[in-house]
């Protein structure tokens, strides 16, 4: 009869490498006497004999993972008892191996030129993939501005127009390589001018011809805007070619007028405008009709900081050797003025001289600045400062005041356009943008009642506190 | 002839103050804005703080905001700027100039010789 | 925050005509900005060329002009001498936010 005989593990278990969904086998070869009895665990968690997804055979000495998974990584155990001496282990690892998976490939992206596109590539596998991508039929190379990113995504910063194309990521380690499907890169990029319309000077009845050249993508559509309005009448003629739109206005010329070219392209719900304006003057046309000349741009004086709309454009008139200055000068001298009159006039009068003489400009060829809106003159005349007005027009015939080289003369109401007949041909003063309700107190003013309306408007301040605080000094 | 001459600079420890003052003199100094411009050693130049002819306002860059302080006695014919809480990077030569016209940001058409302000502990 | 950009150095040959530029590292140079030039020569104040984009500053040479091309302001330096040889810095008024002025890194001409 055999002698007893404690179990000894002849084959240890050694570390087994695995392929997802393919089968893995330890074998835990035991020598002993009676026959051992065998268990497995997997992280020191015991494995049941009844768990379907492992098969154990030869008297326990075989354990099969029959389709291996990624969570089945671990450090797997058999242990061998017959009763004789003491239990025996051996222990091995299994390392579950893993082809590149892409689990979220890129998708189509549309970005406006400029900005920030990541374009997704999240993969799976072990050993983990490298990630690179593809753009077209070329690998793409990483700069300053385009990036593989440590999950795979590949991210451009100020995207251009070259970055537009077909993009696909592609993951490999040691058991094989994936592909995502190709991705397409749309670039948006806004409207922009690439040739404005020129300025004439025709005699009268003449025809001409605008040209204004656009890019953008999509690619734009260009419309035509005629002092403010539609284009009432003339040709338009349009050509398309690469991304580039090219339109051309024929106009039969019998007034003067400044021509706008508005370039428009849609971005999802967004729309990007571009503009560029021409002036058509017609020779030998009077003087006194002729726009002064000058040129816009931004107010970065004091005295009317805090009542002209900020970050426009203001005329500036070039008559003045130094016009900035010039006009400064006068509105400072003029601000001295305002100084003794009533705490209701004061901001209203403000405002209309600050508009008046800081007028708001449409920048072109020939520039041109926007007179303020006769009904908000009015305001200010006869109803604001109606005692004042009357006062002033009495000691300077035409004007607020005289200093010692200019005048500055109010505007003259009747002569500004109005707001109701063209709204976009003169410029409202925000301070009187509130309801008339908020007047408790009409000034007396000769005539029985004023003859202007107050613009009926949102109301935005129920008082007028007094514009920025300027020491005169 | 117009003529800037800025004094007050000096070695001052991080954290401390100055206080840098520009005589102006061969203009009627409150017709005028007023600037401050440094330049660090071997750098460019950089605009500090602008106040108009009024002294009604006062501008900086954004680094010395709360920091710096520009004003102007007119009837002195001298512009200031307080320099409290100074850093390392303070460390320039001053340089005082006048503007083009009343409001401060008209050109900078005439320049001092400039003040060294150096922070260092 | 909008950086004021220059050429770091430019060379020109004597009698040659250079241009210097000064734009923004995003938008572009209006006449809104009113860009002024200055040339500095190594230990000395700055000196003022041109204001509000092309008026020239008294005293200033011809020779210097400057304009907007395209979206920069320029200063363009014709008949090049050996003493234009200094650094040039532009200066804008920047309105957004807060005004301020802010002036380029400066460029470096050299007259070979």
């Known amino acids: 009869e055999k002698l007893p005989k404690a179990p000894v593990i002849t084959t240890p278990l050694e570390t087994v490498d695995a392929l997802v969904e393919e089968v893995a086998t330890f074998m835990c070869a035991v020598e002993s006497y009676p026959q051992p009895e065998i268990s497995w665990t997997r992280n020191k968690i015991l494995i049941k004999l009844f768990d379907t997804r492992y098969s154990i055979r030869e008297n326990g000495q075989l354990l099969t993972i029959l389709s291996v998974e990624d969570s089945d990584d671990g450090i797997y155990c058999c242990t061998a008892n017959n009763g004789v001496g003491g239990a025996v282990e051996s222990c091995g690892a299994l390392q579950v191996k893993m082809k590149p998976k892409i689990t979220r490939p890129p998708i189509n992206v549309k970005i406006i030129e400029g900005l920030k596109a990541v374009l997704p590539c999240t993969t799976m596998g072990n050993p983990k993939p490298s990630v690179s991508w593809i753009k077209g039929d070329s690998a793409l190379r990483e700069n300053s501005r385009i990036a593989v990113l440590e999950s795979g995504s590949l991210r451009i910063h100020n995207v251009q127009k070259e970055d537009a194309g077909q993009y696909r990521c592609v993951a490999k380690n040691s058991l094989g390589t994936a592909y995502s499907k190709l991705v397409k890169l749309e670039v948006e990029v806004f409207a922009r001018i690439l040739r404005a319309p020129e300025s004439h000077n025709v005699t009268f009845g003449s025809f001409v011809t605008l040209r204004c050249t656009a890019i953008g993508m999509p690619v734009p559509t260009i419309s035509w805007i005629e002092n403010g309005n539609a284009v009432s009448s003339g040709s338009i003629q349009e050509n398309v070619k690469d991304r580039v739109i090219d339109s051309r206005l024929q106009l039969f010329i019998t007034k003067p007028g400044l021509y706008t070219c508005i370039a428009t392209n849609k971005h999802g719900e967004k729309f990007s405008t571009a503009k560029a304006a021409a002036t058509v003057s017609i020779a030998e046309w009077s003087k006194s009709q002729k726009e002064s000349k000058g040129y816009c741009a931004q107010y970065r004086g004091e005295v009317c900081d805090a009542v002209l709309v900020k970050d426009s454009l203001v005329f500036f008139n070039t008559s003045y050797p130094d016009p900035e200055e010039a006009q400064e000068l006068l509105i400072h001298t003029a601000w001295n003025e305002l100084k003794a009159v009533s705490p209701l006039c004061r901001p209203a009068a403000e405002a209309l001289l600050c508009n008046h003489l800081f007028q708001e400009c449409s920048p072109g060829v020939l520039p041109t600045p926007m007179p303020i809106c006769r009904e908000y003159c009015l305001a200010v005349k006869e109803l604001f400062c109606a005692k004042e007005w009357l006062a002033m027009e009495g000691k300077t015939h035409r004007g607020l005041y005289r200093s010692g080289m200019h005048f500055l003369p109010v505007p003259e109401c009747s002569k500004l356009p109005s707001m109701h007949q063209d709204p976009t041909a003169c410029t409202r003063l925000p301070y009187l943008d509130y309801k008339k309700e908020n007047i408790t107190t009409f000034p007396s003013i000769t005539s029985s009642k004023p003859s202007v309306d107050i613009p009926n408007l949102p109301a935005s301040t129920s008082s007028f506190a007094v514009s920025p605080a300027y020491s005169m000094t | 002839e117009v003529q800037l001459l800025e004094s007050g600079g000096g070695l001052v420890q991080p954290g401390g103050s100055l206080r840098l003052s520009c005589a102006a003199s061969g203009f009627t100094f409150s017709d005028y804005g007023m600037s401050w411009v440094r330049q660090a050693p071997g750098k460019g130049l950089e605009w500090v703080s602008a106040?108009?002819?009024?002294?009604?306002?006062?501008y900086y860059k954004e680094s010395v905001k709360g920091r710096f302080t520009i004003s102007r006695d007119n009837s002195k014919n001298t512009l200031y700027l307080q320099m409290n809480s100074l850093r390392a990077e303070d460390t320039a030569v001053y340089y005082c100039?006048?503007?083009?016209?009343?409001?401060?940001?008209?050109?900078?058409?005439?320049w001092g010789q400039g003040t060294l302000v150096t922070v260092s502990s | 925050q909008t950086v004021v950009t220059q050429e770091p150095s430019f060379s020109v040959s004597p009698g040659g005509t250079v241009t210097l530029t000064c734009g923004l590292s995003s938008g572009s140079v209006t006449s809104s900005n009113y860009p002024d030039w200055y040339q500095q020569t190594p230990g000395q104040a700055p000196r003022t060329l041109i204001y509000s984009t092309d008026s020239r500053h008294s005293g200033v040479p011809d020779r210097f002009s400057g304009s907007i091309l395209g979206n920069k302001a320029a200063l363009t330096i014709t008949g090049a001498q050996a003493d234009d040889e200094s650094d040039y810095y532009c200066g804008l008024y920047m309105y957004s936010g807060s005004k301020n002025y802010v002036f380029g890194g400066g460029t470096k001409l050299t007259v070979l």
């Open positions: 106040i108009p002819g009024s002294g009604g306002s006062t």
């Open positions: 100039a006048k503007r083009s016209g009343r409001i401060a940001f008209g050109a900078l058409d005439a």
